[in-house]
């Protein structure tokens, strides 16, 4: 019969014959022969391969370096890499999460729209009219101005995006 020029899924072509790829979590030791199947070996303790493959090396699991603010979110297996995330108060600098930076704080005049996670930074938004933030915070939203009317008080000083209104008593000297 004619030697194959292409192989089925989960196979590879070598020496004019189709050999089975090694399953995820295993690496190639020896190609198949016309008499025997592909010889594969499991990846070692801190290694993985996540696809059907003909790799002769397994990949090393990612190291979550605590000196870079990283910690293990999900331990790697022979078929999956370790997933790192950042310590509390920090977030990843990239999708690969190779290092961490402190969560950004929202300055006075800005409130937190979305609290940071291990993989995303704080999202701030300017306080709209009627709201303020007088602190630099990674958690505080814009607060609404105090309603002087509901307290039977009047506005003595208008609020800004950084300060609350100042309420005072009603003027009783009116005719």
């Amino acid at each position: 019969p004619e030697p194959p020029t292409a192989c089925r899924e989960k196979q590879y072509l070598i020496n004019s014959q189709c050999c089975s790829l090694c399953q995820p979590g295993q690496k190639l030791v020896s190609d198949c022969t016309e008499f025997t199947e592909t010889e594969c070996l499991p990846c070692g303790e801190s290694e993985f391969l996540d696809t059907w493959n003909r790799e002769t090396h397994c990949h090393q699991h990612k190291y979550c370096d605590p000196n870079l603010g990283l910690r293990v979110q999900q331990k790697g297996t022979s078929e999956t890499d370790t997933i790192c995330t950042c310590e509390e108060g920090w977030h990843c600098t990239s999708e690969a999460c190779e290092s961490c930076v402190l969560h950004r704080s929202c300055s006075p005049g800005f409130g937190v729209k979305q609290i940071a996670t291990g993989v995303s930074d704080t999202i701030c938004e300017p306080c709209p009219v009627g709201f303020f933030s007088n602190v630099s915070s990674a958690f505080e939203k814009c607060h609404p101005w105090t309603s002087c009317e509901t307290k039977d008080l009047v506005v003595q000083q208008a609020g800004t995006n950084k300060t609350d209104v100042v309420c005072g008593p009603q003027d009783r000297l009116r005719a």
């Epitope: 070598i14 020496n15 190639l28 030791v29 020896s30 190609d31 022969t33 008499f35 025997t36 199947e37 010889e39 070996l41 499991p42 070692g44 003909r54 002769t56 090396h57």
Partner: antibody
């Protein structure tokens, strides 16, 4: 056609050294492990060591420090360097393809350690 | 190193007999075990790998079984060409080393 051909055997004095070669053809060393196995006259098979396609090597405990497996990919050839040879190293030395699926073997080369 | 203990060391049998050889590993090796046949002056020939898989071309009268530490090679009906020495070989799953059993010589009764 897959072939393994050992060479380099012969008579060597105790304490001497010898380098055996294993010429591989019909397949690539870049994706295949090669094991060395020996057999003393009238005795059983004894595993010596292995070199993986990755270049990693492992040895039987008695061979560590005295025997070294290496390869030259450009020549598709394996080597077994044997140092500090003793009378009990007298054996036919085989190279074979694989780890625990040794289908292809060389014809063997005889090493005699004697004064 | 892993140790492979093979028994018996020799067996006398007649053509047509059923012959069983056992092999015990010093620690669990899953199914990373092979059986070889060797005739005088020749290189060994692979009979079984992965404990129970026959290479194509090996007669079906040869069979292997077992996993972990205990393995068996069976020749269901001994043929004249089967008189030889048989070896088991077990390997660490890590790939860090293998060992052969001491061998079983199958002789004509």
């Amino acid at each position: 056609e897959v072939q393994l051909v050992e060479s380099g055997g012969g008579l060597v004095q105790p304490g001497g050294s010898l380098r055996l070669s294993c010429a591989a053809s019909g397949f690539s060393l870049s994706s295949n492990a090669i094991s060395w196995v020996r057999q003393a006259p009238g005795k059983g098979l004894e595993w010596v060591g292995i070199i993986y396609a990755s270049g990693d090597t492992y040895y039987a405990s008695w061979a560590k420090g005295r025997f070294t497996i290496s390869r030259d990919n450009s020549k598709n050839t394996l080597y077994l360097q044997m140092n500090s040879l003793r009378a009990e190293d007298t054996a036919v030395y085989y190279c074979a393809r694989g780890y625990t699926t040794l289908y292809f073997w060389g014809q063997g080369t005889l090493v005699t350690v004697s004064s | 190193d892993i140790q492979m203990t093979q028994s018996p060391s020799s067996v006398s049998a007649s053509v047509g007999d059923r012959v069983t050889i056992t092999c015990q590993a010093s620690e669990s090796i899953s199914t990373r075990l092979a059986w070889y046949q060797q005739k005088p002056g020749k290189a060994p020939k692979l009979l079984i790998y992965s404990a129970s898989t026959l290479p194509s071309g090996v007669p079906s009268r040869f069979s292997g079984s077992g996993s972990g530490t205990d393995f068996t090679l069976t020749i269901s009906s001994l043929q004249p060409e089967d008189f030889a020495t048989y070896y088991c070989q077990g390997g660490y799953s890590s790939g860090a080393g293998t060992a052969f059993g001491g061998g079983t010589k199958v002789e004509i009764k």
